[in-house]
Interface confidence: low
């Protein structure tokens, strides 16, 4: 198919373009070029007849066109108006027509752009700046660069007017940068000179240095003031409100106590019209003052608050020292000293951090100590404890319960019986109790400062008859030779005797058995499998006696070294090999076999029918107890003799 290719497609003004013909048919009569998308005689550029090899200009011929024998058309010194479509009309020898259309676009060579601005000296946080890339050029793309980087993404940056205008809203000092614009079209690209944005800002709040505010008599006072500002700020100093001088630095030699007071630095920006001031209070001491401790938190809460203790006053070139409980500071990750040692921070205070704390200022002759400071750490209440610990009482006695919970400030206590409030006291006294006084006794401790409350509940049973006791254990499945077990006879009762039996017998004498807690607790140290017995506890008083149900101790043990049976190690060929492995263990172990190191099966019995000498070798039984985490094994050598030879008999016997 006949096609036209424009080389190049995008043409710069003044350059040339070649309309290159592809698939031109053979045996032509001639061809003609037209401006536009169709054959229009009024817009013919040039015609060419093969036979005469002559070109004839048409109405649209400009004198800049050259036609080639291959039908391609060269247009030189391109102008803007040349943009558009071009149609080739081919007449073949058989007078059949064929047409093809091509096109190109003409773009101007771009001039070097420049940037215009609507505000040469914008004020920070107040003004907007609009940069416009000049000149406005048709079919041009506009790009912007900030410090030779493409535009950052920012809600304060907005492109408009076909990207020709870059607006910076609410300019900041950070917008002070080099801005360039670039114009591009398909045939050229030009970049402007850079424009530096000069943002007026400040002054910020001035800073006075050095920071120390305490001086000794006779020293020189040299204060410097600085405030970020564009243009640079103008500075003024005031002492106790009275103007001193318009300089950035204030110098007073050989100061005295009379130089104490408020020192104000004022920074002024003449372009923004803004003023900012900073005041520092200077104290001049006639001699080193006695230090004192200030705290940022007089009532810190335990495990919540940090406390910063600061040694006052701040004095230049001074060494600060600290003591806690009349000792130098202990090493602790919760104790932190500031760089100048003036501030001691206690992170996450505890009730043990009360102190006392002292700080000291070291001078040439001695160390001046502050008065001690005690921290009032608020804590608790902890879980209250109810005493005595008895839960069983006989009718007719007096019930006297006392409640205590560690707390600062001291806890306020309330007693509830079966959920009903009784009284707001630390002690609860009920005389001449009866069975009706049985119930749930709750002590509630409340810390009014922290707002925290904690409760403890105790079951009180009033009965002439002792209840049937029960045994609690701290370890239901102890491991042999490793664990200890403590049995406790419940409940705890007043004026009660506790007794123990093992397998129906009184306790044997053994260094591994220990009674404690008024015989209420029986401890077995380093339990063995022989301790797996029935344990019973009993309680008795002058009125009644009772025994618990037995508790059988389940001791985990083993596996012991396994035994392989039968013990035979020599077999005749053709016999059946039936080996059984057994190991004492609780719970029962898992068994596995290996022959000559090769795993076989996970069974207790290994059976091989009609063995041959090939079955000679080492037979290992492995046992494993998952509960104790222990393993064991045994190895047995098996020899298989060929039929007819009796192992162990000498020849000719």
């Amino acid at each position: 198919k006949l096609t036209i290719e424009s080389t190049p497609f995008n043409v710069a003004e003044g350059k040339e373009v070649l309309l290159l013909v592809h698939n031109l048919p053979q045996h032509l009569f001639g061809y003609s070029w037209y401006k536009g998308e169709r054959v229009d005689g009024n817009r013919q550029i040039i015609g060419y007849v093969i036979g005469t090899q002559q070109a004839t200009p048409g109405p649209a011929y400009s004198g800049r066109e050259i036609i080639y024998p291959n039908a391609s058309l060269l247009i030189q010194n391109i102008i803007q108006n040349d943009t558009g479509f071009y149609t080739l009309h081919v007449i073949k020898s058989d007078l059949v027509n064929e047409e093809a259309t091509g096109q190109f676009r003409v773009y101007p060579e771009l001039p070097k752009p420049s940037i215009s601005s609507n505000n040469s000296k914008p004020v920070e946080d107040k003004d907007a700046v609009a940069f416009t890339c000049e000149p406005e050029t048709q079919d041009a793309t506009y790009l912007w660069w900030v410090n030779n980087q493409s535009l950052p993404v920012s809600p304060r940056l907005q492109l408009s007017n076909g990207n020709r205008t870059l607006t910076l809203f609410n300019v900041t000092r950070n917008d002070t940068a080099s801005y360039k614009c670039e114009t591009q079209n398909p045939v050229s690209a030009r970049r402007s000179d850079s424009v530096i944005l000069n943002v007026l800002y400040g002054p910020d709040a001035p800073t006075i240095s050095p920071l120390n505010t305490s001086y000794r008599s006779g020293e020189n006072l040299n204060l410097s003031c600085h405030a970020a500002s564009n243009p640079p700020a103008q500075y003024s100093w005031f002492v106790n409100g009275t103007f001193q001088q318009s300089t950035q630095e204030l110098f007073i030699p050989n100061i005295t106590v009379n130089n104490s007071g408020s020192y104000t630095c004022q920074a002024h920006n003449s372009d923004t019209g803004l003023n900012r001031t900073t005041v520092t209070t200077i104290t001049v001491y006639a001699e080193p003052p006695k230090p004192f401790i200030t705290s940022n938190n007089s009532n810190p809460v335990e495990d919540e608050d940090a406390v910063a203790l600061t040694c006052e006053p701040e004095i230049q070139n001074t060494t600060y020292l600290w003591w806690v409980n009349n000792q130098s500071l202990p090493v602790s990750p919760r104790l932190q000293l500031s760089n100048d040692n003036r501030t001691l921070t206690l992170l996450s205070v505890t009730r043990n951090d009360v102190g006392p704390y002292e700080c000291g200022i070291q001078n040439e002759l001695s160390v001046d100590h502050s008065d001690p400071v005690i921290l009032n750490v608020l804590y608790g209440p902890d879980d209250p404890t109810i005493s005595p610990s008895y839960t069983y009482y006989r009718p007719g006695v007096n019930l006297s319960l006392s409640c205590h919970a560690a707390s600062n400030p001291p806890a306020q206590y309330s007693w509830l019986i079966d959920g009903n409030i009784q009284q707001h006291t630390q002690e609860l006294f009920i005389s001449n109790i009866t069975e009706k006084n049985s119930g749930l006794y709750t002590c509630q401790a409340n810390n009014s400062a922290s707002g925290h409350s904690r409760t403890t509940v105790k079951t009180i049973t009033v009965s002439a008859e002792l209840p049937k006791p029960s045994i609690s254990s701290n370890n239901s499945k102890p491991v042999e030779d490793k664990d200890a077990v403590a049995f406790t006879c419940e409940p705890e009762a007043q004026n009660t005797t506790y007794l123990w039996w093992v397998n129906g017998q009184s306790l044997p004498v053994s260094p591994r058995l220990q009674l404690s807690n008024g015989n209420r607790t029986l401890t077995l140290f380093n339990v063995t499998r022989n301790d797996a017995r029935a344990y019973v506890c009993g309680i008795q008083n002058s009125v009644s006696a009772n025994r618990s149900d037995p508790v059988t101790l389940d001791v985990l043990y083993g596996p012991d070294t396994p035994i392989i049976s039968p013990p035979d190690s020599s077999y005749l060929s053709g016999a059946n090999l039936n080996l059984s492995c057994h190991s004492a263990s609780n719970p029962s172990p898992q068994y596995s076999w290996r022959i000559n190191g090769i795993p076989q099966q996970h069974t207790q019995v290994l059976f091989i029918a009609k063995i041959t000498p090939n079955n000679n070798g080492t037979y290992a039984c492995f046992v494993s107890n998952l509960a104790t985490g222990r393993n064991n094994s045994i190895v047995k050598s098996i020899t298989v003799s060929a039929s007819g030879t009796s192992p162990g008999l000498s020849a000719g016997a």
Epitope: L143, S150, Q184
Partner: nanobody, 116 residues
Framework: QLQLVESGGGLVQAGGSLRLSCAAS????????MAWFRQAPGKQRELVAA???????NYADFVKGRFTISADNAKNTLYLQMNSLKPEDTAVYYC??????????WGQGTQVTVSS
């Protein structure tokens, strides 16, 4: 005009990687820069990464450190290497010139789906 054909999308698990390609007919850097965009369902198209003809790159904060844009001028091809993908990266991804002049000529895009 610049013709753009994106490819390389697909379904990937969170934490996985994909590499997108964009074949351009005509000069890849016709206006001196190219970019990748994405559009999630019900959301506006957003700029993900851009590269200039000089090779300098810019990234949106939400992909910084995970995505890398590159170009092969000889092949007129733009790439986007996407690592440590997240479910919120699910979108249709397009390449184009970064500025509005090129936005009349969108390609068909390539779908990226990140499952959790």
């Amino acid at each position: 005009q610049l013709q753009l054909v994106e490819s390389g999308g697909g379904l990937v698990q969170a934490g996985g990687s994909l590499r997108l390609s964009c074949a351009a007919s005509g000069s890849l850097f016709r206006i001196n820069a190219m970019a990748w965009f994405r559009q999630a369902p019900g959301k506006q198209r957003e700029l993900v990464a851009a590269i200039t003809s000089a090779g300098s790159t810019n990234y949106a904060d939400f992909v910084k450190g995970r995505f890398t844009i590159s170009a092969d001028n000889a092949k007129n091809t733009l790439y986007l290497q996407m690592n440590s993908l997240k479910p919120e990266d699910t979108a249709v991804y397009y390449c184009n010139t970064p500025w509005p002049v090129g936005r009349d000529y969108w390609g068909q895009g390539t779908q990226v789906t990140v499952s959790s």
